[in-house]
């Protein structure tokens, strides 16, 4: 699987799970949120070549297709499988709420 | 939908069902196969900027983390939603079978 | 259900200023990613700016020309175009993305027209 465990002890060109940060307030201008203060999105990057982590058989046959043909633009890409809610505690005026986000956090990658 | 009833009458850089003919023979080397000679692929690609069909709350997050932060290299990514199979014929001997392969034709794009 | 109302457009000389507003409904507002959109004809729809909480981002094209700024107390969002062009006729969407709530989702305006032409 294209997830933490494997991706993050790896350097990888190829599609595989990347760490990424996201800081509500800064990297968002998201002040409204109290708790988290950021999380841990990750997100999913890299190349797709033949039979990497294929999602269906169309993108089999598309990175097939591309590696016979590489003149082709044509080829899967790198995009998240797995996903995790976020729970976050805002105010509506002073009343607390807590919320879950659903498929916030990527947890594993596939080529599609 | 990003299908071709929008993609294929709209010249669209952002993401969109693109059309793509396979000849099996010559694109993948099936001799194999009977039954068709090839079939309309199709696959996705463009880019997926802020809100554009975006799937899930993380590809909006991230679409907006992106456009936030240019220099940033996480963004949503252009890939397949709606995918149909295609009826193939080919010879095991001198025997028939007619075949049904899943996910093989490419009907709608997401940004994912 | 979430009510994004645009107003503002209309005609106007290259090198004049128009301010476009979209209102939105209050009980989201203080939370929602407020942006502006445009489809000019025959073109792909495409961002113009983004107020998200405090932070303001424009496209390439209307850098140092627009401005986006937001009152959370009147629960609207304005875009002020300064020396307009030409090609910045289009008819301008403002757009809710609401992150969280029962109302969670985007929201679109109907359009207003902005026509640059002498």
């Known amino acids: 699987a294209l997830d933490a465990a494997y991706c993050f002890r790896n350097v990888q060109d190829n599609c595989c799970l990347r760490p990424l940060y996201i800081d509500f307030k800064r990297d968002l201008g998201w002040k409204w949120i109290h708790e988290p203060k950021g999380y841990n999105a990750n997100f999913c990057a890299g190349a797709c070549p033949y039979l990497w982590s294929s999602d269906t058989q169309h993108s089999r046959v598309l990175s097939l297709y591309n590696t016979i043909n590489p003149e082709a633009s044509a080829s899967p890409c790198c995009v998240s499988q797995d996903l995790e809610p976020l729970t976050i505690l805002y105010y509506i005026g002073k009343t607390p709420k807590i919320e879950q986000l659903s498929n916030m956090i990527v947890k594993s990658c596939k080529c599609s | 939908a990003l299908d071709a009833a929008y993609c294929f009458r709209n010249v669209q850089d952002n993401c969109c069902l693109r059309p793509l003919y396979i000849d099996f023979k010559r694109d993948l080397g099936w001799k194999w196969i009977h039954e068709p000679k090839g079939y309309n692929a199709n696959f996705c690609a463009g880019a997926c900027p802020y809100l554009w069909s975006s799937d899930t709350q993380h590809s909006r997050v991230l679409s907006l983390y992106n456009t936030i932060n240019p220099e940033a290299s996480a963004s949503p990514c252009c890939v397949s939603q709606d995918l149909e199979p295609l009826t193939i014929l080919y010879y095991i001997g001198k025997t028939p079978k007619i075949e049904q392969l899943s996910n093989m034709i490419v009907k709608s794009c997401k940004c994912s | 259900e979430v009510q994004v109302v645009e107003s503002g457009g209309g005609l106007v000389q290259p090198g004049g200023s128009l301010r476009l507003s979209c209102a939105a409904s209050?009980?989201?507002?203080?939370?929602?990613?407020m942006g502006w959109f445009r489809q000019a004809p025959g073109k792909q729809r495409e961002l113009v700016a983004i107020s998200s909480g405090d932070r303001e981002t424009y496209a390439d094209s209307v850098k140092g020309r627009f401005t986006i700024s937001r009152d959370n107390a009147k629960n609207t969002v304005y875009l002020q175009m300064d020396t307009l062009k030409p090609e910045d006729t289009a008819v301008y969407f403002c757009?809710?993305?609401?992150?969280?709530?029962?109302?969670?989702?985007?929201?679109w305006g109907q359009g207003t027209q902005v026509t640059v032409s002498s």
């Open positions: 757009n809710a993305y609401v992150p969280v709530g029962e109302s969670r989702g985007d929201y």
């Open positions: 209050a009980s989201v507002f203080s939370w929602s990613v």
